[in-house]
């Protein structure tokens, strides 16, 4: 008779990240008997849902079920059938839905209600869909990267198992850039967090952490672009907007109604003598940078120091992991290397933005034009946000690590969210148990 392999004693969890521009489903896996150990949970699958973010379904909620089908079916395939009923599913919606809720609580609830009904139809243990706060988004991103980097482990190692490891227990700060918001989260050095809204206290694995976090709604890369366009069209003399953030020769028609659809542009809204305008790219990094800086109000600060818009920001401390769109954009621009200085990044952005649109299209033929056209703006925005918004300098730039994955798991808030909801991050350091047969692999 053939020897049957012993069934793996593993558990799974699913988190859907319902972002402003798209939804992604993540499947996590961990050994059942090591639930409270640090660093044992890892991502086994990411499935990107085809289509826009869930907030865009506000006029077609009946299509949400179909929209989620492919990735939920993928989860059905990846996770063994015997585990389906005990696999928790969580959906967290971020800034796109926060913006919709600002517009209409009823519409936001309606979208979430249909999402919940759709996800309840699967054989998993559905735990609910909700709009997470910006503070949660920042905190869970910080937990994710530090968990994956082994920062919560009390064991010191003489060898490095993860990239960026400095072999100390100093946590990394987290920089997250989405389409509609951006988060900054870190442990300041012996600094009082002057605004209670930005202060978080954690006890993780027997250690206390006083964490600063803030989420800037409307300062994700897509909403920042809408803000910039709304600001700049105010002073345009006609329906042509010569825009330094787009490549020379680039042209695009924008509907004014689309521009003013988002709450993020309300402060710039005015009656315009036209229904449409045309963006004409002129590709000038310096002018683009200047235009972006006008989105940051640095004239008012009720604290010892601020980021922008009167939001408290303590002095930066330690290393930072910059992920999500920080990583995707910089990766596309080939600027994620630790060796590239801030001056070099700026230099390369100047060259990139100045390249003619026709040339760019030829060089990146496989990239969708909508995304391709916005890398000049996005790259410039990242530099502006990090340098002028968060006060990184040419010197402290080397402390920013552009991270896509750590140990095969995506950097982002979803893992931290699941670890928290499944109670897999103990407040106290777990007692060491006798070695089990699975301790050594």
């Amino acid at each position: 008779t053939q020897n049957k392999a012993l069934p793996e004693n593993v558990k799974y969890g699913i988190v859907l990240d319902a972002g402003s521009s798209h939804t992604s489903l993540y499947i996590y896996k961990w050994p059942a008997e090591k639930e409270n150990d640090t660093g044992v949970v890892h991502q086994v699958e990411e499935c990107r849902v085809k289509g826009p973010g869930i907030s865009k379904f506000v006029q077609k909620v009946n299509e949400i079920g179909i929209y989620l089908t492919d990735c939920m079916e993928r989860a059905r395939e990846v996770i063994p059938r015997s585990q389906h009923q005990e696999t928790p599913v969580y959906l967290g919606a971020t800034a796109g839905m926060r913006l919709l809720r600002m517009e209409s609580e009823e519409l936001a609830d309606r979208v979430l209600d249909v999402v919940e009904r759709s996800l309840s139809n699967y054989p998993f243990d559905f735990q609910g869909a909700r709009i997470i706060t910006g503070q949660e988004e920042g905190a869970y991103g910080w937990i994710t990267i530090n968990y994956l980097l082994g920062k919560f482990s009390q064991k010191t190692r003489w060898f490095s198992i993860v990239p960026y490891e400095t072999n100390n227990q100093e946590t990394f700060g987290a920089l997250d850039l989405g389409g509609a918001s951006t988060q900054v989260t870190f442990v300041p050095q012996n600094q009082t967090i002057e605004s209670p809204d930005n202060a978080l206290q954690f006890r993780l694995y027997g250690k206390d952490y006083n964490v600063y976090t803030h989420s800037f709604l409307c300062y994700g890369k897509d909403q920042a672009l809408w803000q910039k366009l709304a600001k700049d069209i105010q002073v345009a003399s006609n329906e042509i907007l010569r825009d330094p953030c787009f490549h020379p020769g680039y042209k695009k028609v924008v509907n004014v109604s689309d521009l003013y659809k988002t709450p993020c542009t309300k402060r710039f809204e005015m009656t315009l003598p036209f229904q449409q305008f045309e963006i004409q790219g002129i590709g000038n990094y310096q002018q683009c940078h200047q235009s972006i800086l006008e989105l940051f109000n640095t004239s008012y600060c009720p604290y010892s120091q601020c980021a922008f818009n009167g939001i408290f920001l303590p002095p930066l401390q330690g290393d930072f992991g910059a992920f999500s769109a920080f990583y995707f954009v910089m990766k596309f621009l080939n600027l994620t290397s630790e060796k590239v200085s801030q001056e070099k990044v700026t230099e390369m952005m100047k060259k990139f933005c100045a390249q003619p649109w026709e040339e760019i299209k030829t060089s990146y033929a496989g990239v969708k034009e909508k995304y391709l056209s916005e890398y000049c703006f996005s790259g410039t925005y990242i530099l502006s946000l990090l340098l002028q918004g968060y006060h990184f300098t040419a010197d402290s730039w080397e402390h920013i690590h552009f991270i896509g994955k750590i140990q095969g798991s995506d950097a982002g808030w979803t893992l931290g969210y699941m670890l928290n909801l499944t109670n897999m991050i103990p407040a106290e350091q777990p007692l060491s148990t006798p070695l089990s047969h699975s301790t050594y692999v």
């Epitope: 506000v58 006029q59 809720r101 600002m102 517009e103 209409s104 609580e105 009823e106 519409l107 609830d109 309606r110 979430l112 209600d113 709009i131 709450p263």
Partner: antibody, heavy 114, light 110 residues
Framework: SVEESGGRLVTPGTHLTLTCTVS????????ISWVRQAPGKGLEYIGI??????TYYANWAKGRFTISKTSSTTVDLRMTSLTPEDTATYFC???????????WGPGTLVTVSS | AIDMTQTPSSVSAAVGGTVTINCQSS????????LSWFQQKPGQPPKLLIY???TLESGVPSRFTGSGSGTQFTLTISDLECDDAATYYC??????????FGGGTEVLVK
């Protein structure tokens, strides 16, 4: 279902709190709205409390009316400095634009008179 | 402030006839379609008939139809029945969680 309570006869200048008690659904996933109707008059929107706890009011109601979640099944409408013009039947509803079957309470009558 | 003007304030029609009620908003409703119609009878709370400007609430007869977009909306009641005698209200939803009711239209059935 939803049901209002707390309506009564009060004198001008009085403060009064009405309560909306819900059953069969979660307040953490629903908005609750308050609407009033003076005798023989039309419906008038007062405000809503969202599933997140955020509140929004009609311009005329700002300052004098406060909506708050007081438990997992109750939402209060606090009204201050009442005048005879506030005499009305006060309704609470689950949602507003999509308030379907059994989403509105029967109403509670508030009479402000000296 | 947002104004929702509902006309007429009162209308009378015979059984089997048709009644048309209009609502005009001083600004566009959210998504151009966030408008609902309610029916209210004396001593009762309002009852939802139509939402999203034209979607019939379940259980409501198809004699009730809603149309319109942006700032102009219409409720049409055809094949009028005695039971349709009531006051009808429109309700607009606006950006920023704002709402406004129309003044109401009393429908009398002869």
């Amino acid at each position: 279902s939803v049901e209002e309570s707390g309506g009564r006869l009060v004198t001008p200048g009085t403060h009064l709190t009405l309560t909306c008690t819900v059953s069969g659904f979660s307040l953490s996933k629903s908005i609750i709205s308050w609407v009033r109707q003076a005798p023989g008059k039309g419906l008038e929107y007062i405000g809503i409390i969202g599933s997140s706890g955020s509140t929004y009011y009609a311009n005329w109601a700002k300052g004098r009316f406060t909506i708050s979640k007081t438990s997992s099944t109750t939402v209060d409408l606090r009204m201050t400095s009442l005048t005879p013009e506030d005499t009305a039947t006060y309704f609470c509803a689950r949602g507003l634009l999509y308030s379907g079957n059994k989403s509105w309470g029967p109403g509670t009558l508030v009479t402000v008179s000296s | 402030a947002i104004d929702m003007t509902q006309t007429p304030s009162s209308v009378s029609a015979a059984v089997g006839g048709t009644v048309t009620i209009n609502c005009q908003s001083s600004q566009s409703v959210l998504l151009n379609n966030q408008l609902s119609w309610f029916q209210q009878k004396p001593g009762q709370p309002p009852k939802l008939l139509i939402y999203d400007a034209s979607t019939l609430e379940s259980g409501v007869p198809s004699r009730f139809t809603g149309s319109g977009s942006g700032t102009q909306f219409t409720l049409t009641i055809s094949d009028l029945e005695c039971d349709d005698a009531a006051t009808y209200y429109c309700l607009g939803g606006y950006s920023g969680n704002l709402y406004a009711f129309g003044g109401g239209t009393e429908v009398l059935v002869k």
